[in-house]
Structure formats: structure tokens, C-alpha cells
């Protein structure tokens, strides 16, 4: 079998809401993945599991099942959304994200994603980790090329 390539492209959008009373930030983060099938047969994307970390704390998890089938030598772009909550011991971030004196409220999040593919009864898992800047102060839609530049895509050290 040839390789199945997973490329994390970046954050597509981040939608934010707040609970002032609880000093809580809710961020719905939509990410984009490219999955390339370099084989001469179809592969099934069984599931995608994702989690988001802020300051080494997991703030959101998501799992997508039975996603799609990728044909021979084909590529598919998949969007997935991770709902995240920044609260409790990180509630000081409410002050940062709602600060009126600054325009862009970028925070650094670690995006982790694992793609499980299947072909001929065989399963394969491919994982990626990237740090991303996300604006927690407003709803933001990123151009993907811009997102790669903005989000300083680098593997975890």
C-alpha cells in the first residue's frame, strides 16, 4: 500500500461567545484537513478525533465518524469543528478576550488531530499537532492561505 497523507491546513473560522457571569469563553473552531489517497484503490475515512489545548490544558474535544470515502489517487478536503471552553482556572482569559483597548485578541492553541483510515480491513492512524493563533475577541473567518501565514504552522517542539 502507498501512503495516505494527512495535511492540517489551518483554522477556517472561529466563532466566539461569552458568559460574563461565569467569566467563560466559548470558541467554536472549524479546522480544515486535506487527506490524500496515493493508492490505486479507495480508502474509507473511518473517523477523525480532535482536541484543542490551551496552556497545556485540554479545552475541547470532537469526534467525527463514518466521514467519507476517498477514491484512488484522490484528495478530499474535510472541515471539522471543535467546540472549546475556556473557563475555571483560566477564567483570567475572559479579561484578555474582552479587552476593548486591543484590536486582535490572539491566543495560541495547540490543535491535535488523528485521522483513522481503513482499506481491505486494515486500519491506519495518522496524527498531526500544530500551534495556531485564534482570535478570541471576535468571530473570525480565515482565508486558508492567510491562515497558514497568520497561524505560524509549526510542529510541536
Amino acid at each position: 500500500p502507498r501512503s495516505i497523507e494527512v495535511k492540517y491546513i489551518g483554522v477556517k473560522s472561529a466563532y466566539v461567545s461569552y458568559d460574563a457571569e461565569k467569566r467563560t469563553i466559548y470558541l467554536n473552531i472549524t479546522n480544515t484537513l486535506n487527506i490524500t489517497n496515493n493508492n490505486y484503490y479507495s480508502v474509507e475515512v473511518e473517523n477523525i478525533t480532535a482536541q484543542v489545548q490551551f496552556s497545556k490544558t485540554v479545552i475541547g474535544k470532537a469526534r467525527l465518524n463514518n466521514i467519507t470515502n476517498i477514491g484512488p489517487l484522490d484528495m478530499k478536503q474535510i472541515d471539522y469543528t471543535v467546540p472549546t471552553v475556556i473557563a475555571e482556572e483560566m477564567s483570567y482569559m475572559y479579561d484578555f478576550c474582552t479587552l476593548l483597548s486591543i484590536k486582535v485578541h490572539n491566543i495560541v492553541l495547540m490543535m491535535q488531530v488523528t485521522v483513522t483510515t481503513a482499506y481491505f480491513g486494515h486500519s491506519e492512524q495518522i496524527s498531526q499537532e500544530r500551534y495556531q493563533y485564534v482570535d478570541c475577541g471576535r468571530n473570525t473567518t480565515y482565508q486558508l492561505a492567510q491562515s497558514e501565514y497568520l497561524n505560524v504552522l509549526q510542529p510541536q517542539q
Partner: antibody
Framework: QVQLQQSGAELVKPGASVKMSCKAS????????IEWMKQSHGKGLEWIGN????????KYNEKFKGKATLTVDKSSSTVYLDLSRLTSDDSAVYYC??????????WGQGTSVTVSS | DIQMTQSPASLSVSVGETVTITCRAS??????LGWYQQKQGESPQLLVF???NLADGVPSRFSGSGSGTQYSLKINSLQSEDFGTYYC?????????FGGGTRLEIK
């Protein structure tokens, strides 16, 4: 307004211990971590450790493990720094500060510790 | 531990001039950087947080920039009250560390 009030100067003998305080006011005490720094005379700043009153999470710089201990009295919104087995190298000004994302936004006035026989 | 290399160590500048102080991190700190001013006998004061954001009450002649491992603090049209020592500090991974400081003297 936010204030961090530190205890007064200390003159202590080598081998002894000292406990200094940092009393927070003007904000919800449990929301922000409190950081501690050391500044030796005419020198730069060193981070000692931090304490988060929300969950009592304490982190230390390896260099100060066994030397520094952070404790809290939540009823008075006060964080304490205890320094043990003092030597002349511990003579310095010790600052507490409030953590904010990407910087420490409020600082105490500092506590001067002099170790001398 | 992440090392913060600050330069220059000292400089002497006339009122009205522009000054830039730089800080280099030994690895990517993702804009988790603060700049502080400290005057003789006083506590440090936050000038810039998260690399680019001006703290409350800080004059607009101060500005922070940079990303990755390279950061700078710029002071436009230097005033006499700007003398003192400036420190950068990363807050990316524990232990937080400070730069060695830049002593700014007014000519």
C-alpha cells in the same frame, strides 16, 4: 483598583527562614495566578514560581525548589513566600505580581531581604 | 529552559530620539512576551503584553512587535521620564525567564 501589598523589609541571620506576604485587593482573588520574582542588588529578574488560588496549583522554577515554598490564606487574599536555609545569595528584593496573558500586569512594591550575621 | 537574549545591554540617548530594544528567544515563544520598565528603587511596570498590546496607561510612543523568536520594543520621541531599565520576559513555558535588561540613560 488592583493592588498587591507586600510585607516589610527583613533582616535575617544565615541558616534562618523568612516568610513574606503579598496581599491582593481590588479584584477576584481566585481568578489570577500570583507570580514571585527575585531581584538581587543591581541585577536582573528571576522567576521563582507561581500560585493559582483557583485550584492551589503551584509551580516552581527548578532552581528554587527546596528553597522557596508558596502558600495561601484565601480568607485574607494573601499569598506567602517562605524561604528556608538562608544564605547571603538570598539577599535580594522579592516581588509578587499578578499574571495576565502575555505579561504580569500588577506588581507589589517588593520585600527587601538582607541575610547577615 | 528558554533563554531570552536582550540587546543592547545599555544605551545613552537624547530626548526626542527613537530607541529600539530587541529580545531573542532560544525557541519559538508564540508572542507570549511581556516588556517591562523599571526605575531605580521601584517595581517593574508592564508596558506591553502578548508581544504587541500596550498595557493600560502606557503612552502611545511605546510599541511592541515581533513573532516567533524575535521581538522588539520601540520608543518613539523619547521623553526624560523614559529612563530606567527595560526587561523582556517570555511566558510560553515554565520557567518564565527574563532578558538581562537594557539600561536606558538620557543623554
Amino acid at each position: 483598583q488592583v493592588q498587591l501589598q507586600q510585607s516589610g523589609a527583613e533582616l535575617v541571620k544565615p541558616g534562618a527562614s523568612v516568610k513574606m506576604s503579598c496581599k491582593a485587593s481590588g479584584y477576584t482573588f481566585t481568578t489570577f495566578p500570583i507570580e514571585w520574582m527575585k531581584q538581587s542588588h543591581g541585577k536582573g529578574l528571576e522567576w521563582i514560581g507561581n500560585f493559582h488560588p483557583y485550584n492551589d496549583d503551584t509551580k516552581y522554577n527548578e532552581k528554587f525548589k527546596g528553597k522557596a515554598t508558596l502558600t495561601v490564606d484565601k480568607s485574607s487574599s494573601t499569598v506567602y513566600l517562605d524561604l528556608s536555609r538562608l544564605t547571603s545569595d538570598d539577599s535580594a528584593v522579592y516581588y509578587c505580581a499578578r499574571y495576565f496573558y502575555g505579561g504580569m500586569d500588577y506588581w507589589g512594591q517588593g520585600t527587601s531581604v538582607t541575610v547577615s550575621s | 529552559d528558554i533563554q531570552m537574549t536582550q540587546s543592547p545591554a545599555s544605551l545613552s540617548v537624547s530626548v526626542g530620539e527613537t530607541v529600539t530594544i530587541t529580545c531573542r528567544a532560544s525557541e519559538n515563544i508564540y508572542s507570549s512576551l511581556g516588556w517591562y520598565q523599571q526605575k531605580q528603587g521601584e517595581s517593574p511596570q508592564l508596558l506591553v503584553f502578548a508581544a504587541t498590546n500596550l498595557a493600560d496607561g502606557v503612552p502611545s510612543r511605546f510599541s511592541g512587535s515581533g513573532s516567533g523568536t524575535q521581538y522588539s520594543l520601540k520608543i518613539n520621541s523619547l521623553q526624560s521620564e523614559d529612563f530606567g531599565t527595560y526587561y523582556c520576559q517570555h511566558l510560553w513555558s515554565i520557567p518564565w525567564t527574563f532578558g538581562g535588561g537594557t539600561r536606558l540613560e538620557i543623554k
